[in-house]
Interface confidence: medium
């Protein structure tokens, strides 16, 4: 491993659309990729009237936007679908939304997935 870099070998996997996409619904996903490429975990979710609906979680390909991020944090202001990525095994178990435009102390708390989706 490169010094100071957290190697991602597996991520929490979830697919809300699992029946249509013909995948598992939830589990642990081993992250494969070319040896010279970095690997990340990600989460995508929606905020429907204050209720968090996970869309997908899993491994993400080498993406400069994810480098050296130990926490999975969405910083875009009010996207329709929230996205975050991070480096480190299972780093997508928790994810949060801290929009960069906010100048006051963020009020959003990290989203911790709960059963039945994530045991």
């Amino acid at each position: 491993a490169i010094l100071g870099r957290s190697e991602t070998q597996e991520c929490l996997f979830f697919n809300a659309n699992w029946e249509k996409d013909r995948t598992n619904q939830t589990g642990v996903e081993p992250c494969y990729g070319d040896k010279d490429k970095r690997r990340h975990c990600f989460a995508t979710w929606k905020n429907i009237s204050g209720s968090i609906e996970i869309v997908k979680q899993g491994c993400w390909l080498d993406d400069i936007n994810c480098y050296d991020r130990t926490d999975c944090v969405e910083k875009k202001d009010s996207p329709e679908v929230y996205f975050c990525c991070c480096e480190g095994n299972m780093c997508n178990e928790k994810f949060s939304y801290f929009p960069e435009m906010e100048v006051t102390q963020p009020t959003s708390n990290p989203v911790t997935p709960k059963p039945p989706y994530y045991n």
């Epitope: 996997f13 697919n15 659309n17 249509k20 996409d21 013909r22 995948t23 598992n24 996903e29 081993p30 992250c31 494969y32 990729g33 995508t44 869309v55 997908k56 899993g58 491994c59 993400w60 390909l61 993406d63 400069i64 936007n65 996207p79 329709e80 679908v81 929230y82 996205f83």
Partner: antibody
Framework: EVQLLESGGGLVQPGGSLRLSCAAS????????MNWVRQAPGKGLEWVSN????????GYADSVKGRFTISRDNSKNTLYLQMNSLRAEDTAVYYC?????????????WGQGTLVTVSS | DIQMTQSPSSLSASVGDRVTITCRAS??????LNWYQQKPGKAPKLLIY???SLASGVPSRFSGSGSGTDFTLTISSLQPEDFATYYC?????????FGGGTKVEIK
């Protein structure tokens, strides 16, 4: 070096069958999902089918559902597409493509394609 | 199914020109957007994945941007080998769908 080599294309009459193969080398085949994508003459790209790393899950475009079957033999590093009840509109170059990770965020390597012509 | 709409369908440009191709999804696809280049008689080649990430061996004159439903592929200085057809593709959900393509021709 990643290589994907399709074979099995040819001329077939409407209602007939063909089995396409895609021989993979240069990577750990059983760690990746695989896809078939086709391109009709002079047209754009159309995704046909995919299969996950161990063959446990498959997906199909509505246009081929019930007629085409995707499968893989990881011991032979080979992907297959069994095409039955072929129609004129299935005429296309068929490409196999590797899913860049387990749930197909991108198709990062493609074969050179094999031409399927359905005509009487 | 998610529909992907590319514009323009074709364009004429000269070597050295800055070229921009746009792709619009019928619903938000977050960062599940990839770009491919295809030359006549050849297989498509992955150019950009996850909106902004360059695939292996792709020159830095190619770049991608956007999020949600609107995306852009930019070639900062068109080279002779860049004359080809470009496709966007979403992988947010099955079925995977492609845009109709943009053919970049020599002016």
């Amino acid at each position: 070096e990643v290589q994907l080599l399709e074979s099995g294309g040819g001329l077939v009459q409407p209602g007939g069958s063909l089995r396409l193969s895609c021989a993979a080398s240069g990577f750990t085949f059983d760690s990746y999902s695989m896809n078939w994508v086709r391109q009709a003459p002079g047209k754009g790209l159309e995704w046909v089918s995919n299969i996950n790393y161990n063959g446990g899950y498959t997906g199909y475009a509505d246009s081929v559902k019930g007629r085409f079957t995707i499968s893989r033999d990881n011991s032979k590093n080979t992907l297959y597409l069994q095409m039955n009840s072929l129609r004129a509109e299935d005429t296309a170059v068929y490409y196999c493509a590797r899913g860049a990770n387990w749930h197909d965020t991108a198709l990062d390597y493609w074969g050179q394609g094999t031409l399927v012509t359905v005509s009487s | 199914d998610i529909q992907m709409t590319q514009s323009p369908s074709s364009l004429s440009a000269s070597v050295g020109d800055r070229v921009t191709i746009t792709c619009r999804a019928s619903q938000s696809i977050s960062r599940y957007l990839n770009w491919y280049q295809q030359k006549p008689g050849k297989a498509p080649k992955l150019l950009i994945y996850a909106v902004t990430s360059l695939a292996s061996g792709v020159p830095s004159r190619f770049s991608g941007s956007g999020s949600g439903t609107d995306f852009t592929l930019t070639i900062s200085s068109l080279q002779p080998e860049d004359f080809a057809t470009y496709y966007c593709q979403q992988s947010y959900e099955s079925p995977l769908t492609f845009g109709g393509g943009t053919k970049v021709e020599i002016k």
